[in-house]
Amino acid sequence: EAHKSEIAHRFKDLGEQHFKGLVLIAFSQYLQKCPYEEHIKLVQEVTDFAKTCVADENAENCDKSIHTLFGDKLCAIPKLRDNYGELADCCAKQEPERNECFLQHKDDNPNLPPFQRPEAEAMCTSFQENPTSFLGHYLHEVARRHPYFYAPELLYYAEKYNEVLTQCCTESDKAACLTPKLDAVKEKALVAAVRQRMKCSSMQRFGERAFKAWAVARMSQRFPNAEFAEITKLATDVTKINKECCHGDLLECADDRAELAKYMCENQATISSKLQACCDKPVLQKSQCLAEIEHDNIPADLPSIAADFVEDKEVCKNYAEAKDVFLGTFLYEYSRRHPDYSVSLLLRLAKKYEATLEKCCAEGDPPACYGTVLAEFQPLVEEPKNLVKTNCELYEKLGEYGFQNAVLVRYTQKAPQVSTPTLVEAARNLGRVGTKCCTLPEAQRLPCVEDYLSAILNRLCVLHEKTPVSEKVTKCCSGSLVERRPCFSALTVDETYVPKEFKAETFTFHSDICTLPDKEKQIKKQTALAELVKHKPKATEDQLKTVMGDFAQFVDKCCKAADKDNCFATEGPNLVARSKEALA
């Protein structure tokens, strides 16, 4: 229903705390370079204004859209052009073009230093002195680095952060308590960031229909006892919510997400038997819990999928009457039977089924033509199953770091033109799939592996789109979202690539490497590995192993030496010479 004042409506629905958090996230995602202090000032101004509208919905400007109000605030920032260049041009536009312009200027790889976690003691001191400000900084720092982070979910992670600090800051060994807990929150949040970016990419590039298909498949897997109309209702709502968040309508998105959680909890009987535990929680936790809910048990008496979609003589008639509904019911029926498949695979199968009907329903004997369609699914199913098998075997053999290195070599050979930092980031993330998925029960591996890889490859595509350098990457990224992962998997060594010259400085290291945390040390080594492959794209596994082993020994030896600097200075050139020789 229409409200006189949109901002008053959202403030009342969300409450002051969540309202302020969401406004802070919105501003931080739009203007990623502004300091926290500047954003928090704007947040307070918007909040004060919202309160005046709550008191009197007819007050001046209260009838303006939230985009108009937020945009006016952002455009009033002094020195906007100095700090943001052409983003300031957006301010000359009217809504809705102005908001579209802001969205187009979101930077997926902002030039910001990696977020450094302070020492445990310092963290606890600043948290205890001002928890609101401390958590505000957290929202700001995450949101500006991840401009598409799902805002209501970020509020949830801030709440988790708060819980961990509240608990650990009273312990004697604060660091021992904080480190593993905050690492777990960080890991979950980073995965959430790439997953949401994929959803926004899907929405931006392929529209609501594609996203809704994704949602139907996912919901059908989770809620196999719900009817098709119920699944479609949930998928429609989830599509709307994600469209809002991806579009910067964070208040509406969070409000609608809370509404959906309420609806699901009021209609458990028609959705799933697994919801009750989630429904007893407060709003942010409730929504998050519902988003992560385990699959309901598949009904025991489901008939074969062939009955309605292959053997029925009316298939073409049913398809013609309402293509989207018929294909939707196919996707629903197939997905509810296959929680062991990835959503990407289910969408590939639905696409294959649609293409088969398009072809066969125009022919003389449609049933004979589409009669083999389910058998034709087999190669599509086998391909990702083999991918999971081979990659999990490799992961089990090499461990996470070794597996990341294998992936890094593979991807540097596929796309050597891509910048080394991007390749290292992608390979490290792709390599984590082993730890994340290969330890799961067999039935959960495929959906975990493929849907995670798809999200990571989307990040690679988003970064590559900014500065396209590889035709092969462009080709895989331009196609359909569900075909991306198979496209990347099928890439081989890029034969057109002219190897990089060997530059000694690329492989010159200093004693500062010794004091780096393990993660940073790994990144240094992986950077060297990618550069080696760019120099020798056809180097054998044994050659690379020799050089990297030699390199690891060299670092180890010099870091243990009494005069580290001298060791690096004298041993370094020898290492470079040996490496060149080994790769010759």
Partner: nanobody, 117 residues
Framework: EVQLLESGGGLVQPGGSLRLSCAAS????????MGWVRQAPGKGLEWVSL????????YYADSVKGRFTISRDNSKNTLYLQMNSLRAEDTAVYYC??????????WGQGTLVTVSS
């Protein structure tokens, strides 16, 4: 017994508007997804739209998107179809139907909509 009674059809000029209504009885209306289906002269059935009991629209045919709006009033057991920017190709008998699980199980008698100048 289940009854669905459509009304609101008639003759309208291209570009004009009509609002169809469907009065439902004999079942718990707010438990069912409802829809509109049409059949143009000499053609097969075409599903126009579906609406979930909660009021969430879950389907529009591409041919009517942006022009037709389905809605329902559960307190009045009534389904509506607001049709704007009507075209000659929208000429058809419009049926109100109840959706059950996988298909429509009850239909009304239909109301004729003719778009012509």
């Amino acid at each position: 017994e289940v009854q669905l009674l459509e009304s609101g059809g008639g003759l309208v000029q291209p570009g004009g508007s009509l609002r169809l209504s469907c009065a439902a009885s004999g079942f718990t209306f707010n438990h069912y997804t409802m829809g509109w289906v049409r059949q143009a002269p000499g053609k097969g059935l075409e599903w126009v739209s579906l609406i979930h009991p909660s009021g969430t629209v879950i389907y529009y045919a591409d041919s009517v998107k942006g022009r037709f709006t389905i809605s329902r009033d559960n307190s009045k057991n009534t389904l509506y179809l607001q049709m704007n920017s009507l075209r000659a190709e929208d000429t058809a008998v419009y049926y109100c139907a109840r959706w059950s699980s996988r298909a429509f199980d009850y239909w009304g008698q239909g109301t004729l909509v003719t778009v012509s100048s």
